[in-house]
């Protein structure tokens, strides 16, 4: 019999290889790139997903104004170093020995340096602002319906505890979803807001990480919600450290 016949697959992460080679011949799924066994009943960490992505065959408003310390992921994709828990290592380096410090969602939070650069701790991203612009519709969405649908999505699809969805703001055509999760609030087994935001980002881009599920079909009262632009801001528990040169650029 084959693994496929035994339905040895990972519903929450298509970037895995699953095999009946776990203890007692049970199905075990390992993330591509890192080889780490993943828990397929929940989201896989963003670090392991990025690593898998890089290794895969080349194939007065109600709106929130992001804080001056908010980070945007301008550096794009890189092949990260993940720790044995699947989290980003605080210091990341590329093949040419250029190093930088990252936060818990893997976004650079310092200037780039050399191998002597020290990153003492992995700084937690405790506030994520997802800024969306939806395509034109006949009329504005009902704010409370939109709020309920997005909260349901994060609860059911991404398994994020509702208390971590702090707010949903709407000012047509801009939608903002605020996720907040302090270190002290995150209990064992809780999905990390950074992982939920990453799954959501990939869903919005039509690159779902879920195995075999259809893409994201977001509807508010039956009306399709189609996103045409996404910006994600990350706020860390400790503000980032960039030189003035970058800040004035």
């Amino acid at each position: 019999h084959t693994a496929a016949q035994d339905n040895c697959t990972c519903p929450t992460n298509k970037m895995t290889v699953c095999s009946p080679d776990g203890p007692g011949g049970r199905c075990q799924c390992r993330a591509l790139g890192s080889g780490m066994a993943v828990d397929c009943s929940t989201l896989t960490s963003k670090c392991l997903l990025l690593k898998a992505r890089m290794s895969a065959p080349k194939n007065a408003r109600t709106l929130v104004r992001p804080s001056e310390h908010a980070l945007v992921d301008n550096d794009g994709l890189y092949d990260p170093d993940c720790d044995p828990e699947g989290r980003f290592k605080a210091r990341q380096c590329n093949q040419t020995s250029v190093c930088w410090c990252v936060n818990s969602v893997g976004v650079r939070r310092t200037d780039k340096g050399d191998l002597s650069l020290r990153c003492d701790e992995l700084v937690r991203t405790h506030h994520i602002l997802i800024d969306l612009r939806h395509r034109p519709t006949a009329g504005a969405f009902n704010h409370s319906d939109l709020d309920a649908e997005l909260r349901r999505l994060f609860r059911e699809r991404y398994r994020l505890h509702p208390k971590f969805v702090a707010a949903v703001h709407y000012e047509q055509p801009t939608i903002q979803i605020e996720l907040r999760q302090n270190t002290s609030q995150k209990a064992a087994g809780d999905v990390d807001i950074g992982d939920a935001a990453y799954y959501f980002e990939r869903d919005i881009k039509g690159e779902s990480l879920f195995q075999g599920r259809g893409g994201l079909d977001l509807r508010v009262r039956g009306e399709p919600l189609q996103v045409e632009r996404t910006l994600i801001y990350y706020l860390d528990e400790i503000p980032p450290k960039f030189s003035m040169k970058r800040l004035t650029a």
Epitope: H1, T2, P23, M36, P57, P84
Partner: antibody, heavy 116, light 113 residues
Framework: QVQLVQSGPEVKKPGASVKVSCKAS????????LGWVRQAPGQGLEWMGN????????NYNEKFKGKVTITADTSTSTAYMELSSLRSEDTAVYFC?????????WGQGTLVTVSS | DIVMTQSPDSLAVSLGERATINCKSS????????????LAWYQQKPGQPPKLLIY???TRESGVPDRFSGSGSGTDFTLTISSLQAEDVAVYYC?????????FGQGTKLEIK
């Protein structure tokens, strides 16, 4: 029962290449990771890389990148490990092994000797 | 890479006595998702491939005598042979298969005193 049978010993000149085979039987070849391990004379074990024949995913130990190429032929349930640009320090016994939490299945080993 | 360090490098124990080999990893081998330790112990005799004794840090492979036991979690692991037999003379290796690249300890040579 699960068996991994490797090709015989090889003697090669420096600069040459060698391809070692590992024929699997007794299980579904495409369902399990198959790894390659090197053991230089009197030395310990070093993991070189692995392949998942079902989808041809391959991982290499950074130390062996550019030196080793791992492939598999699912039609014959055979994995291959090719070493290029051989040097005297590549002299070793090379093992294939089915990987996994309780996959204690290894080939008998293939001695590759590099000598001018 | 995860570095596996075994101690001692060699060990001489009398027949019937207990033998203990330690293995320390530079990073935790405990997978928080499934609470499994990705640590295996192998026995290798001259001219033979390694033989799996223990996987998951403490689970004995079928057919392995019960005098062999494994313990530990996270970064510190131990292989114990409760009553040494003549056929246990070999080199013993610990191995991490938690995250690529998989790595082995340097080996511990076990002899009879």
């Amino acid at each position: 029962q699960v068996q991994l049978v490797q090709s015989g010993p090889e003697v090669k000149k420096p600069g040459a290449s060698v391809k070692v085979s590992c024929k699997a039987s007794g299980y579904t070849f495409t369902d399990y990771w198959l790894g390659w391990v090197r053991q230089a004379p009197g030395q310990g074990l070093e993991w070189m890389g692995n392949i998942f024949p079902g989808s041809a995913y391959i991982n290499y130990n950074e130390k062996f990148k550019g030196k080793v190429t791992i492939t598999a032929d699912t039609s014959t349930s055979t994995a291959y490990m090719e070493l290029s640009s051989l040097r005297s320090e590549d002299t070793a016994v090379y093992f294939c092994a089915r990987e996994g939490s309780n996959s204690g299945y290894w080939g008998q080993g293939t001695l590759v000797t590099v000598s001018s | 890479d995860i570095v596996m360090t075994q101690s001692p490098d060699s060990l001489a124990v009398s027949l019937g006595e207990r033998a203990t080999i330690n293995c320390k990893s530079s990073q935790s081998l405990l997978n928080s998702g499934n609470q499994q330790n990705y640590l295996a112990w192998y026995q290798q005799k001259p001219g033979q491939p390694p033989k799996l004794l223990i996987y998951g840090a403490s689970t004995r492979e079928s057919g392995v005598p019960d005098r062999f036991s494994g313990s530990g979690s996270g970064t510190d692991f131990t292989l114990t042979i409760s009553s040494l037999q003549a056929e246990d003379v070999a080199v013993y290796y610990c191995q991490s298969d938690h995250i690529y690249p998989y790595t082995f300890g340097q080996g511990t040579k076990l002899e009879i005193k």
